[in-house]
C-alpha cells in the first residue's frame, strides 16, 4: 500500500480555486525527491501537469502552483480559475509518475447555480441554523406571511404565519415577525439537512400586491480534514461545534459502509470495544468544544471520522458535525513494543516503554487508564521524582536502558493492578504507548520476608532467595525512594534451600544493614537484571524500633509468612485522590506540559490494547 495520502474527492464550482494537500512519510529521500500532480488518461498513464522541479503544463500556466513543505511531509497543489474541463481523475505523487508512490484524487467541478435576479444566497454548514430574512411593505403588514420551497416546477409550502408547518420541518423551524416597525419577517431553520438545500421563496400577502423574495440555501457537508499519523502512534481529534450545542451530548463515530457511522466514544458513556484502553474523550469547554485522543493506532483505525452533537449521542440527520479522514502510515517511526505484560499476585512486572530517542531529556510519565467518565489517565509516576502516594515502595520509573527506552517496575502486584497503562513523555505526543498488565496464576519467583523490624544500633540481615533459573542474571538489593532504587552492597551466601527441584545454581543473597539508624527505615527491593535491563523484583518494608534486647537480627523466610507489612493498599485505593496531569495539552496538542503534579484529578491521555505482543511479568 502506498504511504502517500491525500483527499479522495475534491468538489468545487466553476471559477473557484482549490487547494489539494498530499502527505508523504518525511524521510530524507522523500523530502528531496520530485513531487508531481498528473491527470490520469483513459488508457492508463498519467500526464504531468505540474511538478516540484519547475514544470508547469500549458493547461495550468498562470493558474496553478505546487509547494513542497519538507518539514511537515506535505506538498500543496493550488489550482485557480476552475472550469468543468478540469473535472477528472488525478494523482499526486513522489518520484516518477509510473512508480506507484502516489494517491488517486477525483476532482469534480460543477456549474455555478443559475440564480434568479435578486436572489439572496445563504451558505450554511450541515446541522447548523439559517435565518432567512423576508422584507415586506406596509400594505402587507397584516397579511399572511409564508415560505415556499421550489420542488421541481412547483412551490411547496414550508411554513406560514397561520401556524402551518410542513412535516419535513417539524420541530426545527419557526417564523418570527419582527414587529410592524421593521417590516421584516424571518424564518429560522435549525439542524439543517442536506435535503433542505434548494430555492426558497418568501411571501407577504397572497394577491398581486404581495411582496416576494427569492433565497438560495446551500447546505455544506463538511470537507474532511486530512490527518496523517504513524502506525502505533496517536491522533487527537479537536471538535469545535459551537456554543449552541454546548449542553448537547457529543460523539465521535467512524463511518462504515454507506451512511452508517459507528460510535467510537460519546459523552453518554458509550465506547467501542476496539478502543478499550486506548481512547480518551477530554472534557468539553464552556463553548462545547472537546477532543478525543486515540493511541496505539492500528491499520484498521484508518477511515473517516465524524464528531458531532446530538441528544442520542450518535449521528442523526441534522447533527452539526466535523469530519476527518485518518490515514495510518505503516512505514512508522514508532517501534513495536509488547502490548501485554503478565505478572502473578505478589510478584512484579518490568515494563519497557519506548520514547522518541531524540528527546532523551523529556520528562517520562506512566499513567493508569480508567474507562469511567469518558476515559482518563491519572499519573502514577514520573521521571522527576514524583510517585503517587498509594504506590510508594512498589513503583519506580527508571531512565534505563535509555536511548529510546525507559523502564517502569511495579511490584507487590494484586488483581487490582490488572488494566491498561500508558507510557508517555512531555515531548513528542505521538509517542504514547499502551501496555496491558494481566495478573495470571502462579507464585512469585523471588522469596523475601513479608515484613521486617530492625533495632536501632544493631545489625540487620535480610535474605532474598533467587531460583536457579536466574543463574545468568545479576542479583541486587536496593533502597527504594521517589527517584528510583539506590543499589546497596549485598552478600552471596551460596545456594538457597528455599526451592524444591532447584540445583546449586539457586542463590541466597542477603542485604546487611550495620548499625541501623532511623534513616534505614523504608522499602528495600531485591531483584535481577542484565546490565541496564531489569527483571523481577520483590519488596520488603524495614521498620526501625528502639532496642529491646541486645544482639543482631537475622530475618528468616519462616518469619516472612506473617501478615505482610500493612503498607498494602486498601481496597478503595483507586478512589483516593489521584495525582494527575490536568493540562490536556500534554495529550491534545504538541506543546510542553506544565508541571501540574500538585493539581487535582482530571488527566487525559490514551492506550493500545494492540496485538497480542506479550512480555512476561513475574513467574511462569
Amino acid at each position: 500500500k502506498s504511504p502517500i495520502f491525500g483527499p479522495e474527492e475534491v468538489n468545487s464550482v466553476e471559477g473557484n480555486s482549490v487547494s489539494i494537500t498530499c502527505y508523504y512519510p518525511p524521510t530524507s529521500v522523500n523530502r528531496h525527491t520530485r513531487k508531481y500532480w498528473c491527470r490520469q488518461g483513459a488508457r492508463g498513464g498519467c500526464i504531468t501537469l505540474i511538478s516540484s522541479e519547475g514544470y508547469v503544463s500549458s493547461k495550468y500556466a498562470g493558474r496553478a502552483n505546487l509547494t513542497n513543505f519538507p518539514e511537515n511531509g506535505t506538498f500543496v497543489v493550488n489550482i485557480a480559475q476552475l472550469s468543468q474541463d478540469d473535472s477528472g481523475r488525478y494523482k499526486c505523487g513522489l518520484g516518477i509518475n509510473s512508480r506507484g508512490l502516489s494517491f488517486d484524487v477525483s476532482l469534480e467541478v460543477s456549474q455555478g447555480p443559475g440564480l434568479l435576479n435578486d436572489t439572496k444566497v445563504y451558505t450554511v454548514d450541515l446541522g447548523r441554523t439559517v435565518t432567512i430574512n423576508c422584507p415586506f411593505k406596509t400594505e402587507n403588514a397584516q397579511k399572511r406571511k409564508s415560505l415556499y420551497k421550489q420542488i421541481g416546477l412547483y412551490p411547496v409550502l414550508v411554513i406560514d404565519s397561520s401556524g402551518y408547518v410542513n412535516p419535513n420541518y417539524t420541530g426545527r423551524i419557526r417564523l418570527d415577525i419582527q414587529g410592524t416597525g421593521q417590516l421584516l419577517f424571518s424564518v429560522v431553520i435549525n439542524q439543517l439537512r442536506l435535503s433542505d438545500a434548494g430555492q426558497y421563496l418568501c411571501q407577504a400577502g397572497d394577491d398581486s400586491n404581495s411582496n416576494k423574495k427569492n433565497a438560495d440555501l446551500q447546505v455544506l457537508k463538511p470537507e474532511p480534514e486530512l490527518v496523517y499519523e504513524d502506525l502505533r502512534g496517536s491522533v487527537t481529534f479537536h471538535c469545535a461545534l459551537g456554543p449552541e450545542v454546548a449542553n448537547v451530548a457529543k460523539f465521535l463515530c467512524r463511518q462504515s459502509s454507506g451512511e452508517n457511522c459507528d460510535v467510537v466514544v460519546n459523552t453518554l458513556g458509550k465506547r467501542a470495544p476496539a478502543f478499550e484502553g486506548r481512547i480518551l474523550l477530554n472534557p468539553q469547554d464552556k463553548d462545547g468544544s472537546f477532543s478525543v485522543v486515540i493511541t496505539g493506532l492500528r491499520k484498521e483505525d484508518a477511515g473517516r471520522y465524524l464528531c458531532g452533537a446530538h441528544s442520542d449521542g450518535q449521528l442523526q440527520e441534522g447533527s452539526p458535525i466535523q469530519a476527518w479522514q485518518l490515514f495510518v502510515n505503516e512505514e512508522s517511526t514508532i517501534p513495536r513494543s509488547p502490548t501485554v505484560v503478565k505478572g502473578v499476585a505478589g510478584g512484579s512486572v518490568a515494563v519497557l516503554c519506548p520514547y522518541n530517542r531524540k528527546e532523551s531529556k523529556s520528562i517520562k510519565y506512566w499513567c493508569l487508564w480508567e474507562g469511567a467518565q469518558n476515559g482518563r489517565c491519572p499519573l502514577l509516576v514520573d521521571s522527576e521524582g514524583w510517585v503517587k502516594a498509594q504506590y510508594e515502595g512498589r513503583l519506580s520509573l527508571l531512565e534505563e536502558p535509555g536511548n529510546g527506552t525507559f523502564t517502569v517496575i511495579l511490584n507487590q502486584l494484586t488483581s487490582r493492578d490488572a488494566g491498561f497503562y500508558w507510557c508517555l513523555t512531555n515531548g513528542d505526543t505521538l509517542w504514547r504507548t499502551t501496555v496491558e498488565i494481566k495478573i495470571i496464576e502462579g507464585e512469585p519467583n523471588l522469596k523475601v520476608p513479608g515484613n521486617v523490624t530492625a533495632v536501632l544500633g544493631e545489625t540487620l540481615k535480610v535474605p532474598c532467595h533467587f531460583p536457579c533459573k536466574f543463574s545468568s542474571y545479576e542479583k541486587y538489593w536496593c533502597k527504594w525512594n521517589n527517584t528510583g532504587c539506590q543499589a546497596l552492597p549485598s552478600q552471596d551466601e551460596g545456594p538457597s534451600k528455599a526451592f524444591v527441584n532447584c540445583d546449586e545454581n539457586s542463590r541466597l543473597v542477603s542485604l546487611t544493614l550495620n548499625l541501623v539508624t532511623r534513616a534505614d527505615e523504608g522499602w528495600y527491593w531485591c531483584g535481577v537484571k542484565q546490565g541496564h535491563f531489569y527483571g523481577e523484583t520483590a519488596a520488603v518494608y524495614v521498620a526501625v524500633e528502639e532496642r529491646k534486647a541486645a544482639g543482631s537480627r537475622d530475618v528468616s523466610l519462616a518469619k516472612a509468612d506473617a501478615a505482610p507489612d500493612e503498607k498494602v493498599l486498601d481496597s478503595g485505593f483507586r478512589e483516593i485522590e489521584n495525582k494527575a496531569i490536568q493540562d490536556p495539552r500534554l495529550f491534545a496538542e504538541e506543546k510542553a506540559v506544565a508541571d501540574t503534579r500538585d493539581q487535582a484529578d482530571g488527566s487525559r491521555a490514551s492506550v493500545d490494547s494492540g496485538s497480542s505482543e506479550e512480555q512476561g511479568g513475574s513467574s511462569r
Epitope: 513495536r336 519506548p354 531460583p467 535491563f533 527483571g535 523481577e536 512480555q615
Partner: nanobody, 117 residues
C-alpha cells in the same frame, strides 16, 4: 511458536574473531529486547550481552566489555554478536534468548565457540 536458531560458532585461536547470528521467528522480533548468554563446560549460565528492541541501548557483562558487540537487524529478524580478541575462557555454548526478565531458560540448541591454540 517462538524459534531461535544460533549459528556462526566454531574453533578459533586466541585473539581471533567470530560473528554469531541468531535467526528469530514466531514472534514480533522488533518488540523485544534480546540477550546472549553462554554456558561453559561444567559451569552455570553466564549472561553476556543484551540489546533493546529498537537497538538503541546495549549492555555487556564486565568479562566481555570492549571485546564483544551486540547488534540486531529488525528487518531480517536477526540478532548478532561480534566477538573480537577471543580468550580461552570465552569457550562455551552461546545461546540467544528473548528477554522477559523472568529467568526463562534458553530453549534453543546454541552454537559452540571454542577458543584454543
Amino acid at each position: 511458536e517462538v524459534q531461535l536458531v544460533e549459528s556462526g560458532g566454531g574453533l578459533v585461536q586466541p585473539g581471533g574473531s567470530l560473528r554469531l547470528s541468531c535467526a528469530a521467528s514466531g514472534f514480533t522480533f522488533s518488540s523485544y529486547a534480546m540477550t546472549w548468554v553462554r554456558q561453559g563446560l561444567g559451569k552455570g549460565l553466564e549472561w553476556v550481552s543484551i540489546i533493546s528492541g529498537n537497538g538503541g541501548s546495549t549492555s555487556y557483562a564486565d568479562s566481555v566489555k570492549g571485546r564483544f558487540t551486540i547488534s540486531r537487524d529488525n528487518a531480517k529478524n536477526t540478532l548478532y554478536l561480534q566477538m573480537n580478541s577471543l580468550k580461552p575462557e570465552d569457550t562455551a555454548v552461546y545461546y540467544c534468548a528473548k528477554w522477559d526478565g523472568l529467568g526463562t531458560l534458553p530453549g534453543s540448541q546454541g552454537t559452540q565457540v571454542t577458543v584454543s591454540s
